[in-house]
């Protein structure tokens, strides 16, 4: 018996087609993805093949103005229109709190939304009961398939799930649910979830009874053969893991932003064992037409967005590199721009001794969600900025000891190279890392811009001195693993909305040209 699994993950509000780098579509003939194009391809496959499942591995929420304005209603509407069969909860589904998940999505979705390792407690337990499930058994042709969901246990550090949801270890939570499905004679089981490729592989290895793992969160691109676009494969598609009980378990992920449709064909024997698996992500480029009916619906929903955010704020004459390939690995000029805006927003001439009360900014690279192309006449709109800073956070003022900052910069590179979001972009700071040293001892130079000076210059960080720093509220609250900031901050004052800070700065400057200028170096 053959099953076709179509899958998406980390779509992040890319309902409309995008440029190749997943930013706003500029040249329509070269644009990719979007739900109208996705629907064309899905329907084509559904017509051609008998047993098809369309699955999403989480993080539909957050990423463009679509989410800023519609807050998840757009996700439910268009996923319903595409007839998704199931979705796993991602960490970003909690960005607007539990209510922001329940009302627009959980109550409106016509497909099951899954997570086995999220347990509700307190007053929320009865309110959310049945709105998401640990697993769902789906009819596919004459057979049934069990889909069991999971969500990153780091979600409380990455989003806003509140205090009444407990995120358990994925493997510990999944095993009893899979066992239950086996007891119920469901012998074809897909683990669908949002914890990243490393966890996906562990699930394939450790959870007895899981036949296929469909993942997300790490934006992993897998491909067999010559890749069709710019993404470099992290491995073959599917990635085969040998489980502890000796089975070959295919693991897949489909990059992000709706640029690809994952396409996996699995052949099962009569006992539900995987005999073979093959496939590849399908690049959703302009050779695939956008479905006219879905496109018309998109255009109808788009009207509200146009009113919201299409006025020009200012211009850029350089490419604003907000790609994860840059901002999670090295100094990026988008990070510099945002940090400069954050400092500018906090200019308060204190007295004759201080040129300003604060000179430093830190910003998690993972919070920068999109680049901005200067080739669109250099125009920057609120909409562009909403794709870069989609989380609706604030840029806050904290007071920290130098020793805490040093710990933060060590944390910034403690697992460098895995494209994780904690890599820090900076302003008013010069940092030098030596990655040949062991984690926790990689910061070899950390100089900070003086405030008590008439001519600002960089001096070595002093461990016992108290510094003011501007940072996202996400970091102040210990997000991305920066627990030391949350635990050790001496004062925290909440600030202005992030997009507003940057838009005000761009409007003030009129023309911007941020550079990469040696704020972050590697020795």
């Amino acid at each position: 018996w053959e099953l076709t699994i179509l899958h998406t993950n980390d779509v992040h509000s890319r309902l409309e087609q995008t440029s190749e780098d997943s930013s706003k579509c500029v040249n329509a003939s070269r644009c990719m993805g979007g739900v109208a194009r996705l629907f064309t391809k899905v329907q084509q496959i559904r017509r051609a093949e008998p047993n098809v499942l369309l699955l999403d591995a989480g993080d539909q929420y957050q990423g463009t103005i679509w989410f800023t304005v519609y807050k998840g209603a757009e996700v439910a509407h268009f996923m319903n229109a595409l007839r998704y069969d199931a979705m796993a909860l991602g960490n970003h589904e909690f960005d607007n709190g539990v209510e922001g998940l329940i009302e627009p999505l959980l109550k409106e979705a016509k497909f099951p939304i899954l997570s086995a390792n999220i347990k509700a407690k307190g007053p929320l337990a009865s309110q959310i009961s049945g709105l998401y499930l640990p697993y769902k058994v789906l009819p596919v042709g004459d057979e049934v398939v069990g889909i069991v969901g999971y969500t990153s246990k780091e979600t409380p550090f990455l989003s806003n799930p509140g205090t009444n949801l407990v995120f358990e270890d994925e493997i510990t939570a999944l095993q009893p649910e899979v066992d239950k499905l086996k007891t119920l004679n469901v012998n074809k089981i897909i683990a669908l979830g949002h914890s990243g490729f490393e966890t996906d592989k562990l699930i394939a290895q450790k959870v007895r009874g899981v036949d296929v793992v469909v993942g997300g969160h790490s934006n992993t691109f897998l491909y067999t053969g010559n890749p069709p676009s710019k993404e470099v494969p992290a491995g073959k598609y599917p990635f085969i893991v040998t489980s502890d009980d000796g089975r070959k378990v295919p693991v897949v992920q489909a990059y992000a932003f709706g640029k690809y449709l994952g396409y996996l064909k699995i052949e099962f024997d009569e006992r539900g064992n995987v005999i073979s698996s093959h496939g590849n992500p399908i690049l959703l480029n302009s050779s695939i037409p956008e479905d006219p009916s879905i496109k018309a619906d998109i255009n109808k929903w788009r009207i509200k967005l146009d009113n919201y955010s299409t006025q020009e704020l200012g211009k850029t004459i350089v490419y604003l590199d907000g790609s994860s390939q840059s901002c999670r690995f090295r100094e990026c000029n988008m990070g510099n721009l945002i940090c400069d805006a954050m400092i500018n927003n906090n200019l308060r001439h204190a007295d004759e001794m201080f040129w300003n009360h604060v000179s430093m900014c830190i910003l998690n690279g993972g919070g920068i969600r999109s680049p901005i192309d200067e080739r669109n006449n250099g125009t920057i709109t609120w909409e562009n900025l909403a794709a870069v800073l989609p989380f609706g956070g604030t840029f806050d003022l904290v007071q920290l000891k130098g020793s805490t900052l040093k710990k933060a910069f060590e944390h910034s590179v403690h697992r460098y190279g895995q494209s994780t979001g904690e890599f820090l972009q900076v302003g008013g700071i010069h940092v030098v890392y030596d990655l040949s040293r062991k984690p926790g001892d990689r910061v070899v130079k950390l100089d900070v811009l003086c405030t008590k000076c008439r001519v600002p210059s960089y001096d070595p960080l002093k461990m016992d001195e108290i510094y003011k720093v501007i940072l996202p509220n996400f970091l102040a609250n210990g997000g991305d693993g920066f627990q030391m900031i949350k635990d050790e901050l001496l004062r925290h004052d909440s600030g202005d909305q992030d997009i507003n800070v940057v838009s005000t700065y761009i409007s003030k400057m009129k023309v911007i040209y941020p550079a990469v200028e040696g704020r972050i170096k590697f020795s």
């Epitope: 099951p112 049945g130 499930l133 697993y135 789906l138 009819p139 049934v144 004679n185």
Partner: nanobody, 128 residues
Framework: QRQLVESGGGLVQPGGSLRLSCAAS????????IGWFRQAPGKEREGVSC????????YYADSVKGRFTISRDNAKNTVYLQMSSLRAEDTAVYYC?????????????????????WGKGTLVTVSS
Amino acid sequence: QRQLVESGGGLVQPGGSLRLSCAASGFLLDYYVIGWFRQAPGKEREGVSCISGSDRSTYYADSVKGRFTISRDNAKNTVYLQMSSLRAEDTAVYYCAADPSPVTVQAMCLPRFPVPYWGKGTLVTVSS
């Protein structure tokens, strides 16, 4: 081989009663949410009543509330639908369905999501 087999249908006069049975073979109904659905000629299939396996909570469509009663006998691996005060508009093919997923009885009956197991149906005709 998993099977749901409905029985008990037939011709009944308006105001009369019938008891439908749904017998399961190949799986234990204790772990399943079970639903009775019906489809009248030229109409969409609709959920009539559903019962959970765990707490035996029940759900009834507004059109049958107070007239139909769903129950289950796990020892016999059977679910029943007691129908009384029958009306002409109750005429339909009645289907039994089962889902091992932990869906609510309301979600099962709407049905909000696809249901994996179905019987072949039994015809109920209410006519004088």
